[in-house]
């Protein structure tokens, strides 16, 4: 997992046209931030959504020679003190001299010096800097020793998750070595690594390391702006856990973030042990994610079990796509804290109705308007089968309110059923007392006539599944449906002539391909006569139109041929293309007509077995 070297190797490949030992770096436009080029960033030409420009520099350890291409020469080597000058960390060099550290790092030994760049010192709080400069023999020396290890450690030796004792009181240095090649020390990024010295190595870092003696718990307890979070963490028994050893990342909502919550939401969550613990754990990662490690969106699992997406937009960290981090990289002895101005509420702490997204607002508005929201009690468990907004036509919305309420009741189940609990043939009962059938296909899950879209969620008191269409529970059997529709009278008479009517009246699961009367218009009277005269042949043909099992066109993977075996024994080929069902390559005029014992697909030709 030597990611730094892998990324460096990629940068070398990108730079090899420029000569030996040349590395391609990407610099974020308008900043001094430079990164060795990852494959992803190279092609995206951006980092954190900011445009980058490509620079070609000598790879670490090499230098240019006049009149020669690339970087053919090895950089001069010196002791650690001299190397600080070679890498341009002249402020750190000057401070090393002033604090009498120079003698130590010029002499024999083997040291790793995480040397803050000149810019890093300039960015240090002026009061802290003055304090160090006014006590060079103790405070400054201690601060510099806290940037050092008494052993040469190249980036390949700096493994993710290591805690290395520094040369000041063995205070731990948190090492993170990320897959994108970023290496951080207490969240300071190594911006110029592996400058080898005769007595060790120098890594230039982008900030001055401040001493960290406290845990995340200590910080929360001391920080006034986290009093609401502190109270919530105590209530949910999470605070103590943040005092233990670990490599945590805490997204800590400030008091302002808690004030933004709608009235009653926090009270409800904090009054519920399970929900409050979920809320708190959703703000914690079990891995240490420094801001400098984030170069694009990545998904991380929280202690609560669900994931959050951490990304970046310029200098800002984003959480679930939103800029919300006020202060980043507060390093403690068991992790890092980022202060955020929003409370992150996991699904597991939400009421079922709160799980609905922007695409289900019509459904949730109707649930509220028609008085169904009050039926969803916090202590009960429900499942919402929420159709997307565009499933509701103007005709549906202008229906009689009582009728609309009945339709909506068909979209609320009496129990909590998660996506992984659904199975083919399952019967689900709605709060209106209707029974809905579940059909599970290779790439789709459908309930009655409507199939699910991605986005199922589970909340504190229920689950929500997203549907493409309004669910219409079947009322009539296959036979009743054929009788009711005049288009199918010819096929129905053939069914009766073949003595197969009974088959369509009994309970079961069938798929029936029904030719309209038009399908028979082109037939000669002789062909029709043959059909009726030879009962065996007729039965054969009719049974070819019937398949065991309910196969909904919308349940098929688009563009893929599905081979089904008919009751007659021969195969029939179905394919869904552009929302149209093809039956043996013939376009179905109408599909997915649901019945209590199956589904009808309408065709405009009589089908013959091969």
């Amino acid at each position: 997992n030597n990611h730094y070297d892998k990324i460096l190797a990629h940068s070398r490949i990108r730079g090899r046209d420029q000569g030996p030992n040349v590395c391609a770096l990407q610099q974020i436009l308008g900043t001094k931030k430079k990164y060795f080029s990852t494959c992803k960033n190279w092609y995206k030409k951006s980092i954190c959504g900011q445009k980058t420009t490509v620079l070609y520099e000598c790879c670490p350890g090499y230098m240019r020679m006049e009149g020669m291409k690339g970087c053919p020469a090895v950089l001069p080597i010196d002791h650690v003190y001299g190397t600080l000058g070679i890498v341009g960390a002249t402020t750190t060099q000057r401070y090393s001299d002033a604090s009498k550290l120079r003698e130590e790092i010029e002499g024999k030994g083997s040291f790793t010096y995480f040397a803050p760049s000149n810019e890093a010192w300039d960015n240090l709080d002026s009061d802290i800097r003055r304090g160090l400069e006014s006590n060079v023999n103790v405070e400054l020396l201690n601060a510099l020793h806290s940037h050092m290890i008494n052993k040469r450690m190249l980036t390949k030796d700096l493994k993710n998750g290591m805690i290395i004792p520094s040369m000041y009181n063995n205070l731990g240095l948190f090492i993170n070595h990320y897959p994108n090649g970023v290496v951080t020390v207490n969240c300071a990024r190594i911006i110029h690594g592996n400058q080898i010295a005769t007595n060790g190595v120098v890594h230039v870092i982008d900030r001055v390391l401040t001493q960290i003696g406290t845990s995340i718990q200590d910080f929360i307890e001391a920080e006034d702006d986290l009093s609401s979070f502190r109270a919530a963490a105590i209530t949910s028994d999470i605070l103590e856990a943040l005092g233990r050893d670990g490599h945590f990342t805490l997204f800590a909502p400030t008091n302002e973030a808690f004030e933004k919550l709608p009235r009653g939401v926090l009270e409800r969550i904090m009054g519920d042990k399970v929900a409050s613990e979920a809320l708190m754990k959703y703000h914690i990662l079990n891995t240490l994610q420094c801001s400098e490690s984030i170069m694009g969106g990545a998904v991380f699992e929280t202690l609560e079990g669900n994931t959050i997406e951490i990304g970046c937009d310029g200098d800002s960290i984003t959480v679930n796509g939103i800029k919300m981090v006020n202060k980043k990289d507060i390093v403690t002895n068991n992790g890092v804290i980022h202060l955020i101005d929003q409370v992150l509420i996991p699904d597991s702490a939400k009421q079922v109705i709160e799980l609905a997204g922007k695409q289900q607002t019509t459904f949730t508005d109707l649930v509220a308007q028609l008085g169904l929201a009050s039926a969803l009690r916090p202590d009960g468990e429900y499942t919402l089968l929420a159709p997307v907004n565009n499933a509701f036509s103007d005709d549906t919305l202008s229906m009689d309110q009582r009728l609309l309420k009945l339709i909506l009741q068909n979209h609320i189940l009496k129990v909590k059923v998660g996506l992984n609990e659904l199975y083919n043939g399952q019967i689900l009962e709605t709060i209106g007392g209707k029974q809905l059938r579940v059909f599970v296909y290779r790439t789709a899950v459908c309930i009655e006539n409507s199939c699910m879209e991605k986005g199922s969620k589970q909340g504190r008191n229920g689950a929500i599944h997203i549907f493409r269409e309004i669910i219409k529970p079947a009322e009539k059997s296959l036979h009743e449906k054929l009788k009711q529709d005049k288009r199918f009278s010819t096929f129905l008479s053939l069914l009766e002539a073949a003595d197969l009517k009974e088959l369509l009246t009994q309970p079961g699961d069938w798929t029936l391909f029904v030719p309209t009367n038009d399908a028979f218009k082109g037939m000669t009277s002789e062909e029709k006569e043959i059909l009726i005269r030879d009962k065996n042949a007729l039965q054969n043909i009719i049974l070819y139109h019937l398949t065991p099992g309910v196969f909904i066109g919308k349940g098929f993977e688009p563009g893929v041929t599905n081979i089904l075996k008919t009751t007659q024994g021969s195969k029939i080929f179905l394919k869904e293309v552009n929302d149209t069902l093809l039956v043996n390559e013939l376009k179905s005029k109408e599909s997915d007509i649901m019945t209590t014992n199956g589904v009808i697909h309408v065709v405009d030709k009589l089908l013959y077995p091969a």
Epitope: C59, P60, I77, E104, K108, G109, S110, N150, N194, G200
Partner: antibody
């Protein structure tokens, strides 16, 4: 100047243990790792392991993990290596070496003889 | 573990002549433009003495007759001209990868 003092020799019986010492002077003991190297009679050199005197952290060569135990006493700036279950194979000169780039400072070595 | 193979195992060189000892590593000992190979001299009854560090840098107090060269896997220690006091065993040593390892040694005899 940097000095690493080791006793000249130790005679030990097979199956017994021995604790070798290495007293450091002339530098800040906790600022440098201490390494131990074995040299069998007429043989080459083998790295045994290292210890960080500031916190007692150790790294061992797999080969010596069960044979050697490294410790330090900061108050006396002394590093120790205990060798257990000694056999004739363990008869050798053992050096302590300060952890510089390139091992610049060596003790004089302790000759351990395992004999009944 | 990185294996260091020294050759020849022993050599006899006339006073004033050049002695060359090779050290071959089983894998590269280079990192960031530096070779983590070091050369020692050892005389009977004494601990090894550092001559050359990081493949080519002369340790302070060591005569300039000693020099080191090479990169990646192939390294050379050269003594030119050889003096009577140079009779000893010479070892190469790598610390690019843990565990650090030593070569088998090359015994130099002065004719």
């Amino acid at each position: 100047q940097v000095q690493l003092q080791q006793p000249g020799s130790e005679l030990v019986k097979p199956g017994a243990s021995v604790k070798l010492s290495c007293k450091a002077s002339g530098y800040t003991f906790t600022s440098y790792w201490m390494h131990w190297v074995k040299q069998s009679p007429g043989q080459g050199l083998e790295w045994i392991g290292e210890i960080n005197p500031s916190n007692g952290r150790t790294n061992y060569n797999e080969k010596f993990k069960t044979k050697a135990t490294l410790t330090v006493d900061k108050s006396s700036s002394t590093a120790y290596m205990q060798l257990n279950s000694l056999t004739s194979e363990d008869s050798a000169v053992y050096y302590c070496v300060r952890g510089d780039e390139g091992f610049a400072y060596w003790g004089q070595g302790t000759l351990v003889t395992v004999s009944a | 573990n990185i294996v260091l193979t020294q050759s020849p195992a022993s050599l006899a060189v006339s006073l004033g002549q050049r002695a060359t000892i090779s050290c071959s590593a089983s894998e590269s000992v280079d990192s960031y433009g530096r070779s983590f190979i070091h050369w020692f001299q050892q005389k009977p009854g004494q601990p090894p003495k550092l001559l050359i560090y990081l493949a080519s840098y002369l340790e302070s107090g060591v005569p300039a007759r000693f020099s080191g060269s090479g990169s990646r896997t192939d390294f050379t220690l050269t003594i030119d001209p050889v003096e009577a006091d140079d009779a000893a065993t010479y070892y190469c040593h790598q610390n690019n990868e843990d565990p650090p390892t030593f070569g088998g040694g090359a015994k130099l005899e002065i004719k």
